[in-house]
């Protein structure tokens, strides 16, 4: 039975040419974390496997960095990177748990971090 | 150039072991993974693990744990698959690849191995 | 593990025509998917990696496109030199596997 939560840093917005700090965690379960996913919409960002490390998707290289942690930091941000990330918990023996989370890049100096809040559990993505 | 080259053809008896070789160059070692990658006559490629040079780290599939080992030496950039127990269906060609970012860009050359009696 | 099931088994089409090859994942990979080009005697060659982007040197006339569990490799236009086995692979969660394969031929 899959027991855990993800805690993502939920709707979130920065400035155009900003960066931005994705985060998620995941509790409540003594699963192993075997790889973490990042993806963007339908594309595939990044992925940090417990055994091998970080791996960035070439194309993103330039603007993706690793972390902190499991997280990932987004780099000079345009307007069309709005949109939903998804953090996905590849786990033992639990299965995959998926975060969400929403990026608004704004034109101007308005960004602000919205509030943190917790998704429950889930298997399958989108 | 980036170069994967493969230590030559083996022939061995059923229960035996078999360690193949892959000499990098013409990159940093440490940077790319390294992956083993078999096909037996007649079937689909089939991924057998993979190791992080730099941290030494690795990863294998299940069916092959206990059986096969991964290792890696920086000082001569060369990686290397070791398959124990040996039985007729490990007959194929073994290849290593660079591996960026899980795809694999550079191939060795391939290494048969052929497990007969 | 993560199935990848390529449909043909085999194609034979004219040169200069198209050739369009079917991968289907088990479960959700994202864009976590290369298509390799195997010929006999050879070591397989990398032609497309994150479903859609062609790698380094390979002919425009290949392209790839798809997103989540359904994956295209196209050839624009057959060439001789096109014929050998064509394999996608899933680079999304170990253990990376790949499809049976699809024998392309010349008509």
């Known amino acids: 039975m899959m027991t855990g939560t993800i805690e993502t840093t939920g709707n979130i917005s920065a400035e155009k040419g900003g960066s931005i700090i994705l985060q998620c965690h995941l509790s409540s379960t003594t699963a192993q974390v075997t790889q973490v996913n990042w993806e963007q919409q339908d594309q595939l960002l990044a992925i940090c496997n417990a055994d091998l490390g970080w791996h960035i998707s070439p194309s993103f290289k330039d603007r993706v960095a690793p972390g902190p942690g499991l997280g990932l930091t987004l780099q000079s941000l345009t307007v069309n990177d709005t949109g939903e990330y998804f953090c996905i918990y590849h786990t033992y023996p639990d299965g995959t748990y998926t975060g969400r989370i929403f990026l608004e890049v704004l034109e101007s100096s308005v960004a602000e971090h919205g509030a943190r809040f917790q998704i429950p559990h889930h298997h399958h993505h989108h | 150039e980036v170069q994967l080259v493969q230590s030559g053809a083996e022939v061995k008896k059923p229960g035996a072991s078999v360690k193949v070789s892959c000499k990098a160059s013409?990159?940093?070692?440490?940077?790319?993974?390294i992956e083993w990658v078999r096909q037996a006559p007649g079937q689909r490629l089939e991924w057998m693990g993979v190791i992080n040079p730099g941290s030494g780290g690795t990863n294998y599939k299940e069916k092959f744990k206990g059986r096969v080992t991964i290792t890696a030496d920086k000082s001569s950039s060369t990686a290397y698959m070791e398959l124990s127990s040996l039985r007729s269906e490990d007959t194929a060609v073994y290849y290593c690849?660079?591996?960026?970012?899980?795809?694999?860009?550079?191939w060795g050359q391939g290494t048969t191995v052929t497990v007969s009696s | 593990d993560i199935v990848m099931t390529q449909s043909p088994d085999s194609l034979a089409v004219s040169l200069g025509e198209r050739a369009t090859i079917n991968c289907k994942a088990s479960q959700h990979v994202s864009t976590g998917v290369a298509w390799y080009q195997h010929k006999p005697g050879q070591s397989p060659k990398l032609l497309i990696y994150?479903?859609?982007y062609r790698y380094t040197g390979v002919p425009d006339r290949f392209s790839g496109s798809g997103s989540g569990t359904d994956f295209t490799l196209t050839i624009s236009s057959l060439q001789a030199e096109d014929v050998a086995v064509y394999y996608c692979q899933q680079h999304y969660n170990t253990p990376h596997t790949f499809g049976g394969g699809t024998k392309v031929e010349i008509k």
């Open positions: 013409g990159y940093a070692f440490t940077n790319y993974l």
């Open positions: 994150s479903a859609s």
């Open positions: 690849a660079r591996g960026e970012y899980f795809f694999f860009d550079y």
